[in-house]
Structures are given as structure tokens and as C-alpha cells.
């Protein structure tokens, strides 16, 4: 056979679907790799072919489109499972070809089991909402294209495995779930179960979103440096270990890049000859405010090191802050001996 442009295994598309539920998977060629869409390709005489490699197998095989109840079918550039089975897990390939042209890409599909409380190995999208801040809506994700607009599905929302009925600030409204003045107690996994009929059969779509209530933009501040500060003096004798923590509080800001760094005599630690180690740790509050600590340490400090200027810097999208550490050499009182 002629050469085929092989885009390899597209691991960016780690598709996870629930066992025993419908799944519609679009061929990634038209979304990420080729400049034209399926209709254009089809009208140009190109054919889309699907095949797969089962989990833990090397052999590529054609997909069986003659299963009972048309369990697996292809419609335009979409591969349909009605529904999935556990052993559908594997790498799927879609290939677009005619006698002179060929392009293909593979992608992994994982069929995931869940229990009555929607616990599973599925990775859930995270929806962040501001604390005590207006009305937030989440929409049951990835249900487009499963049923026509003429079909009115039933939608039930759950928090964990409890149906959302009479929750004090959470209201299900069909495909949407509204949060009125969100609170930290609203954190958790919210699941919508969409049930719809098709050709005399009933299908369920289960979608879970993790809700995380975060700090409000009205509370957003530039970085606050807690340490070093003017009250603490790092007084050391030569040969001792010098340890200076730079502890910075960042209020939560959506998509903010929080940075902390030290300068020594105006230079980055890598650009000075001192033997310095810097260790960083990060902790988060319940609303994802961040406390970042960078500990600067010099194992055996020299008199020269104790004369240097150590400055902690911090930056977020709201601004910058800096604070010098007060470092001095300990004065050793002279020892008097009585003859």
C-alpha cells in the first residue's frame, strides 16, 4: 500500500468514557491535524476508515460494525458506541484515504467503570467559582450531539451520590445547576445523569464536574510578604548556618502566575559564587489562597556573606513586593581572664 501520513498516537486526547453508556468520538484528524473538515474530504472522494488495537494487543483489526443492535456504528466523522463495553478499551485509528492520498491518527480510548455513587477512575473537569460572589452556573458537559433538539431528556443532578433536592443554595434547572452565593461547603463532585430514549431504547449519560470555591476577585491583592520582615534580625557567627525563610501570601486570582525569588546583592542566586541552597514549599487555603515559602540557606556562612544584601521578591498579576532580610554578624564579646 502507498505511504500514509501517520500522525502517530495522539496522547493529548486521552478519551475516557463510562462503561454501559453511549459515546460519540470524533476523528481527531479534522479537529487537530488537517486543514479541511469531513464534508470537504468526503466530497473530494476520500473515505474514512476506522480500526483499533485492543488493550494489551499489538494487532490492528477492523472495527466490527455488524454487532447486534448496531452497538458500534460510524456516522460521518463520528464513531458511535451505543453503549460502550469494558473491553472496548484500546487504541482507535481513523484513516482518511483514496488511491493517491492517505492520512491517519490513533488515539487511546479508556472505558471506565463507575459505582452507584459515581466513584470511578475518571478524570473530572474542575469548575472554579468565587466565594460569596453572585450566581454561578455549571452546565452538564459533553452531551451535545447525543440526541436531537426534539428529544427532551430527563436530567438529575447529584452531589456525591445524593440527589440535589432542596439544597439551600444549589438549584437544578435542567442541564444547568445554579449556585447562589457559593460557599466553601459547596465544594465537591456534582454529577448530572442525562436519560434519553432512542429507537425504543433508553440511554444514560453520566457527567461529573468538580466544583472548587475559590477566593473572590474583590479580595485579590498584590503579594504579601510575611517573612523576612523588619522585626527579625538574622544574627550569625561566621561558620554557622544561615537560614532565611521568604514566606509570601498570594490571594487567589484566576489564572495568576505566582512567583517568589531571592536576590543576593541584586543578583539571582545562580549568578553568585556563594554555596546557597533554596527549597520551596507551597500550601493552600480552602479557597486556594496560596502561601509560598522559599527557604534560603548557606551551610557555613562567611563574614563576607553576612555583609550581603538578601532580598525576597514576589509577583502576581496584581503587583510586586520585595523585602530585604536583616542579616548581621554576631559580635562576640571579648573574654577576660583573671590572672
Amino acid at each position: 500500500s502507498e505511504r500514509c501520513d501517520d500522525w502517530g498516537l495522539d496522547t493529548m486526547r486521552q478519551i475516557q468514557v463510562f462503561e454501559d453508556e453511549p459515546a460519540r468520538i470524533k476523528c481527531p484528524l479534522f479537529e487537530h491535524f488537517l486543514k479541511y473538515n469531513y464534508s470537504t474530504a468526503h466530497s473530494s472522494g476520500l473515505t474514512l476508515i476506522w480500526y483499533w488495537t485492543r488493550q494489551d494487543r499489538d494487532l490492528e483489526e477492523p472495527i466490527n460494525f455488524r454487532l447486534p443492535e448496531n452497538r458500534i456504528s460510524k456516522e460521518k466523522d463520528v464513531l458511535w458506541f451505543r453503549p460502550t463495553l469494558l473491553n472496548d478499551t484500546g487504541n482507535y485509528t481513523c484513516m482518511l484515504r483514496n488511491t493517491t492520498y492517505c492520512s491517519k491518527v490513533a488515539f487511546p480510548l479508556e472505558v471506565v467503570q463507575k459505582d452507584s455513587c459515581f466513584n470511578s477512575a475518571m478524570r473530572f473537569p474542575v469548575h472554579k467559582m468565587y466565594i460569596e460572589h453572585g450566581i454561578h452556573k455549571i452546565t452538564c458537559p459533553n452531551v451535545d450531539g447525543y440526541f436531537p433538539s426534539s428529544v427532551k431528556p430527563s436530567v438529575t443532578w447529584y452531589k456525591g451520590c445524593t440527589e440535589i433536592v432542596d439544597f439551600h443554595n444549589v438549584l437544578p434547572e435542567g442541564m444547568n445547576l445554579s449556585f447562589f452565593i457559593p460557599l466553601v461547603s459547596n465544594n465537591g463532585n456534582y454529577t448530572c445523569v442525562v436519560t434519553y430514549p432512542e429507537n425504543g431504547r433508553l440511554f444514560h449519560l453520566t457527567r461529573t464536574v468538580t466544583v472548587k470555591v475559590v477566593g473572590s476577585p474583590k479580595d485579590a491583592l498584590p503579594p504579601q510578604i510575611y517573612s523576612p520582615n523588619d522585626r527579625v534580625v538574622y544574627e550569625k557567627e561566621p561558620g554557622e548556618e544561615l537560614v532565611i525563610p521568604c514566606k509570601v501570601y498570594f490571594s487567589f486570582i484566576m489564572d495568576s502566575h505566582n512567583e517568589v525569588w531571592w536576590t543576593i546583592d541584586g543578583k539571582k542566586p545562580d549568578d553568585v559564587t556563594v554555596d546557597i541552597t533554596i527549597n520551596e514549599s507551597v500550601s493552600y487555603s480552602s479557597t486556594e489562597d496560596e502561601t509560598r515559602t522559599q527557604i534560603l540557606s548557606i551551610k557555613k556562612v562567611t563574614p563576607e556573606d553576612l555583609r550581603r544584601n538578601y532580598v525576597c521578591h514576589a509577583r502576581n498579576t496584581k503587583g510586586e513586593a520585595e523585602q530585604a532580610a536583616k542579616v548581621k554578624q554576631k559580635v562576640i564579646p571579648p573574654r577576660y581572664t583573671v590572672e
Epitope: E19, S116, S154, R201, L202, H204
Partner: antibody
Framework: QSVEESGGRLVTPGTPLTLTCTVS????????MSWVRQAPGKGLEWIGS?????STYYATWARGRFTISKSSTTVDLKMTSLTTEDTATYFC????????????????WGPGTLVTVSS | AFEMTQTPSSVSEPVGGTVTIKCQAS??????LSWYQQKPGQRPKLLIY???TLASGVPSRFKGSGSGTEFTLTISGVESADAATYYC????????????FGGGTEVVVK
């Protein structure tokens, strides 16, 4: 094709117990199997199901205390922290074949096994 | 949580009469409803599935109807062999279910 339950007996409260449903002529990779119980003089009560792929679903009241698992020819129901309220005949039932909905339509039932919880 | 309500709990009818049993779902179950017959000391037996489809070997005097939330089992020309308890059961979902079965209706044939 047949379904038969075993393992029912008299136990004291708090004792764990496992019931086994043995199937004959049924490929469990194609069928959902369910456990249903019936207390003396009372109605039918669904405990839970294991579908063809192995996922399990339970009644809200049964979560945590009952566990369903299956092998190629058996479906087990593990019960813990039994109380006198759990005294019942336990039935194993097969769901209709087909990929949707009908797996909770029980077309083949076992004769049941009696569990008595008494001190 | 999802509930199935079955009425009446008991009904008495002479031979040849008609028995009507109703079943109501707390939310739409489309046509995913089954009816079972259980005689004392015996296992339940599937009578009707998908609201109106007769299981194999079930006499045509049994008729199921309804969709959505309201369903009916009708036994026309009732016979003494029909004395039993009848249960409806939803098969639409296994989520958040206390019990997919209705409470049962005892049919006494006089």
C-alpha cells in the same frame, strides 16, 4: 439455563455471610445479574446488580453493607453487620439480554435461599 | 430518591371479572416498566416488560399499558390460577434507588 442460590442459613446478628448464585448455561459476560430479597410476608426488595462488564450498582440502603462480585459461573453477595431486619429469602435473578434498560428486567429467577438472623 | 407506588395493595374479584392494578413512578421511566407475578412460596415470574410486551408463555388476558409515570396491569377474564401477588418494577435507572419494585398487589380470586 438455570440460576440457583446457596449459602442461606441461620446466623446471629453481626455475623457476615456470603451467598452464592450459580448459573448454568448462562454466559455472565453477556448478562446483568441482580440480587433481590423478600422478608417473610413482605414485598420484593432490590439489593443490587452486577452488569455484564462487571460494574456494580446498589440500592441506596444497601451501599457499604452489601457487595456483589462475579466470576465466570457464580455471582456472590457478601453481607456484613447483619441484623434481624435482614431475615429474608434472597433471590438471584438474570436481566434480559440487550445493551440497555432491559438488564433490569428479570426474566429468570432462582428458587431463593433463606437467611435467618436471630440471636 | 426514585419511588414506585403501586395501588391497590389488595383486590378481590370473582372468576371472569377484570382486575386493574396501577403503578406510578416518581419520575418518567419512559416505557421501562415490568410486571411480575408471585404465588406463595414460589419465585417471581416475569409477565410483562417494556410496559406492554408479554413475556413468552404468558396468556393474553394479561395486558400492560402506560408510559412515562403512569402504568396499568389489566387482567381480563380472571381465573383462579391468577390468584397471586403482582409487582411492578422500573428498569430505567439504577441510580439513587431505594427500591425499583412497587409494594405489591394481592389478587384474591373468589
Amino acid at each position: 439455563q438455570s440460576v440457583e442460590e446457596s449459602g442461606g442459613r441461620l446466623v446471629t446478628p453481626g455475623t457476615p455471610l456470603t451467598l452464592t448464585c450459580t448459573v448454568s448455561g448462562i454466559d455472565l459476560s453477556n448478562y446483568a445479574m441482580s440480587w433481590v430479597r423478600q422478608a417473610p410476608g413482605k414485598g420484593l426488595e432490590w439489593i443490587g446488580s452486577v452488569i455484564s462488564g462487571g460494574s456494580t450498582y446498589y440500592a441506596t440502603w444497601a451501599r457499604g453493607r452489601f457487595t456483589i462480585s462475579k466470576s465466570s459461573t457464580t455471582v456472590d453477595l457478601k453481607m456484613t453487620s447483619l441484623t434481624t431486619e435482614d431475615t429474608a429469602t434472597y433471590f438471584c435473578a438474570r436481566g434480559c439480554p440487550g445493551y440497555n434498560g432491559d438488564k433490569y428486567t428479570f426474566d429468570l429467577w432462582g428458587p431463593g435461599t433463606l437467611v435467618t438472623v436471630s440471636s | 430518591a426514585f419511588e414506585m407506588t403501586q395501588t391497590p395493595s389488595s383486590v378481590s374479584e370473582p372468576v371472569g371479572g377484570t382486575v386493574t392494578i396501577k403503578c406510578q413512578a416518581s419520575q418518567s421511566i419512559y416505557n421501562y416498566l415490568s410486571w411480575y407475578q408471585q404465588k406463595p412460596g414460589q419465585r417471581p415470574k416475569l409477565l410483562i416488560y417494556r410496559a406492554s410486551t408479554l413475556a413468552s408463555g404468558v396468556p393474553s388476558r394479561f395486558k400492560g399499558s402506560g408510559s412515562g409515570t403512569e402504568f396499568t396491569l389489566t387482567i381480563s377474564g380472571v381465573e383462579s390460577a391468577d390468584a397471586a401477588t403482582y409487582y411492578c418494577q422500573q428498569g430505567a435507572t439504577s441510580y439513587d434507588i431505594e427500591n425499583p419494585f412497587g409494594g405489591g398487589t394481592e389478587v384474591v380470586v373468589k
